[in-house]
């Protein structure tokens, strides 16, 4: 229901807002940390900016019905069309309790539209408990608050991010369903803008209360690698990022925003076919530890540190990084044991404003995406969109550590 700058992207025939009707695997484990790159010469299943290019292994008889991969934060299992479990992962929304199912009329009738939804449970995404998400018509979900428009480009769950226009057909709907333990979004019979003759797509994303994420594909009428990304990115996977503020050298009284995409999983688009499914199972993260002892003794793929002031366990790579820096947590944790903290009062904390945001591990991470912009009072309220796809090309997995100055 909102402006869609970049004219031409939202054009659909007639009145696009006409009302709609109702409606096993095996393991390949690798301990990884940011900067580590596993063997790049195998067939690529997915790209993981936290751990470099990951390998796709085949079953002994060379069939790839089920593929499992480890991405530091998640283990993904890909189920091919012939795998019975792929059908089991499809949630039949029509069979669900009618009171728990909602056809979203705004999303079902518009293009490049989003709508915020509050979940009935805390969904752990990269270890962060989320209650509010934003469903987009383009086959994906924005995860997290809109602090900065660029942050939304790097915090997503995307079963199939593409230029879908539900306003094209009265049969197209965006439906969601929440039963208290799982939240399912289904893009039902949606068409690609400009590619309507290829047929309709039906797929869904399920967010489980235990943090599992399932992508299930019912109808994929064309080869996903053939979908044009000139008007809209085409992606399948997950991404998370954090934003940090640091003083701008040019304007002393302002602070520069840097958005750091600390982890991304991109699935091979050729694996997205009708009746296939992908299941992401979350791996333990530092954030789940609630005490210093548990934090320091954890045997995770991450280097967990305890910040006594914040009473938080972290690798330093999560959405709370700004606080981690402001309170000098990286320095505090250096060479200290839990016993060292026992006599300290953690209630009198105040941010260390002189603390440099670019400490240690952040600068050594090679797989990163920085998007810088000058702070404005509330630039999510402004119209920053400059037509076309804006800075889409800067979001390529090949982009590593290059600041993009937005000048906002």
């Amino acid at each position: 229901l909102s402006p869609q700058p970049g004219a031409g992207h939202d054009e659909g025939p007639g009145s696009g807002w006409a009302a709609k009707g109702t409606v096993r695997g095996w393991n390949r484990r690798a301990r990884e940390s940011p900067g580590h790159v596993s063997e790049p010469d195998r067939t690529q299943l997915s790209q993981d900016l936290g751990g470099g290019t990951l390998a796709m292994d085949t079953l002994p008889d060379n069939r790839t019905r089920v593929v499992e991969d480890n991405h530091s934060y998640y283990v993904s299992r890909l189920y091919g069309p012939s795998e019975p479990h792929s059908r089991e992962l499809w949630v039949d929304v029509a069979e669900a309790n009618r009171s728990q199912v909602k056809i979203h009329t705004i999303l079902s009738n518009t293009h490049r539209q989003a709508s915020r939804v509050v979940l009935s449970f805390d969904f752990p995404f990269y270890g962060h408990p989320l209650r509010q998400i934003t469903i987009a018509t383009g086959g994906f979900i924005f995860m997290g608050d809109v602090i900065h428009r660029m942050l939304t480009a790097t915090q997503y769950v995307a079963p199939l991010m593409a230029n879908f226009n539900p306003g094209y057909s009265d049969n197209s709907t965006v439906v969601y369903f929440d039963n208290g333990t799982v939240f399912v979004v289904q893009w039902d019979h949606v068409y690609l803008q400009g590619w309507e003759d290829k047929g309709s797509f039906t797929f869904q994303a399920a967010l489980h209360h235990d943090g599992r994420i399932v992508f299930a594909y019912k109808e994929i009428p064309m080869s996903v690698p053939e979908i044009s990304s000139s008007q809209h990115p085409v992606k399948t996977g997950l991404s998370d990022a954090f934003m940090i503020l640091n003083p701008s050298p040019d304007v002393p009284e302002s602070r520069r925003r840097s958005i750091f995409e600390y982890h991304r999983i991109e699935l091979d688009p050729s694996k997205v076919t009708s009746m296939s499914a992908v299941e992401f199972t979350p791996l333990p993260t530092c954030l789940q530890h609630r005490s210093c002892d548990a934090c320091m003794s954890s045997d995770l793929t991450f280097n967990c540190s305890w910040c006594h002031v914040l009473q938080r366990c972290s690798s330093g790579f999560d959405r709370y990084r700004q606080e981690w820096m402001d309170y000098g947590c990286a320095q505090e944790a250096e060479g200290r044991m839990c016993e060292d903290f026992q006599d300290e009062d953690h209630d009198s904390a105040s941010p260390d404003t002189s603390f440099s945001p670019y400490d240690g591990d952040l600068t050594t991470t090679s797989s990163s995406l920085f998007i810088d912009s000058l702070t404005t009072e509330d630039d999510t309220k402004l119209n920053p969109y400059a037509g076309g796809d804006g800075l889409q090309n800067n979001l390529s997995p090949k982009t590593k550590g290059t600041p993009v100055h937005l000048g906002t």
Epitope: D10, S15, W17, R112, T380, G390
Partner: antibody, heavy 127, light 107 residues
């Protein structure tokens, strides 16, 4: 400054037509979805219609569907409401309102209320 | 369509007192809710969006709360200029719908 000014109201007989205009200034009109909202004398607010920024998508309240048409001319920064087959119950002050949008990446956005309103124009349908 | 119901229809309050207005949705609208103020002969003015965020230039005495189906607009200390009619509106789904309004009058 940001401003919306409606015009075209007046007294009209039932079954006749009327066209309302809303002139926008102080902002990039073509970047915003626009709405019409009406208020019958002594009554509450009723949403009437919306049009997307480019004019390609339109949606109407059931009470006016098939009789009213929302349109816009971005080159003239003007919003229109063509009202046909008018009825006595269409008597109201008609406001145009700008959609307050929150921008996300890739041109996505979600709606968050009407942040700019015109002063209204009175339409009286009476024989 | 989603029906929005406001209560009370009229609220009589003395200047300086606290006013609490309620809005109920017939189904969940999450936090996709706005509050407007309208004075006689004037157009409505956006006060709150996202159920709890004050619009630009709105004084801190206005606050919104709630999520799902139950929402509240609170005016902590009524000023003379606050006596008006207040409307809630959901923008979670089409058609967009308003409550019938609550008139806040001087006691």
């Amino acid at each position: 400054q940001v401003q919306l000014v409606e015009s075209g109201g007046g007294v009209v007989q039932p079954g006749r037509s009327l066209r309302l205009s809303c002139a926008a200034s102080g902002f990039i009109f073509s970047d915003y979805d626009m709405h019409w909202v009406r208020q019958a004398p002594g009554k509450g607010l009723e949403w009437v219609a919306v049009i997307s920024h480019s004019g390609s998508n339109k949606y109407y309240a059931d009470s006016v569907k098939g009789r009213f048409t929302i349109s816009r001319d971005n080159s003239k920064n003007t919003l229109y409401l063509q009202m046909n087959s008018l009825r006595a119950e269409d008597t109201a002050v008609y406001y145009c309102a700008r959609d307050r949008s929150v921008y996300l990446y890739y041109g996505y956005h979600y709606y968050e209320g009407f942040d700019v309103w015109g002063q209204g124009t009175l339409v009286t349908v009476s024989s | 369509e989603i029906v929005m119901t406001q209560s009370p229809a009229t609220l009589s309050v003395s200047p300086g007192e606290r006013a609490t207005l309620s809005c109920r949705a017939s189904q969940s609208v999450y936090n996709n809710l706005a509050w407007y103020q309208q004075k006689p002969g004037q157009a409505p003015r956006l006060l709150i969006y996202g159920a709890s965020t004050r619009a630009t230039g709105i004084p801190a005495r206005f606050s919104g709360s709630g999520s799902g189906t139950e929402f509240t607009l609170t005016i902590s200390s009524l000023q003379s200029e606050d006596f008006a009619v207040y409307y809630c509106q959901q923008y979670n789904d089409l058609p967009l719908t308003f409550g019938q309004g609550t008139k806040v009058e001087i006691k």
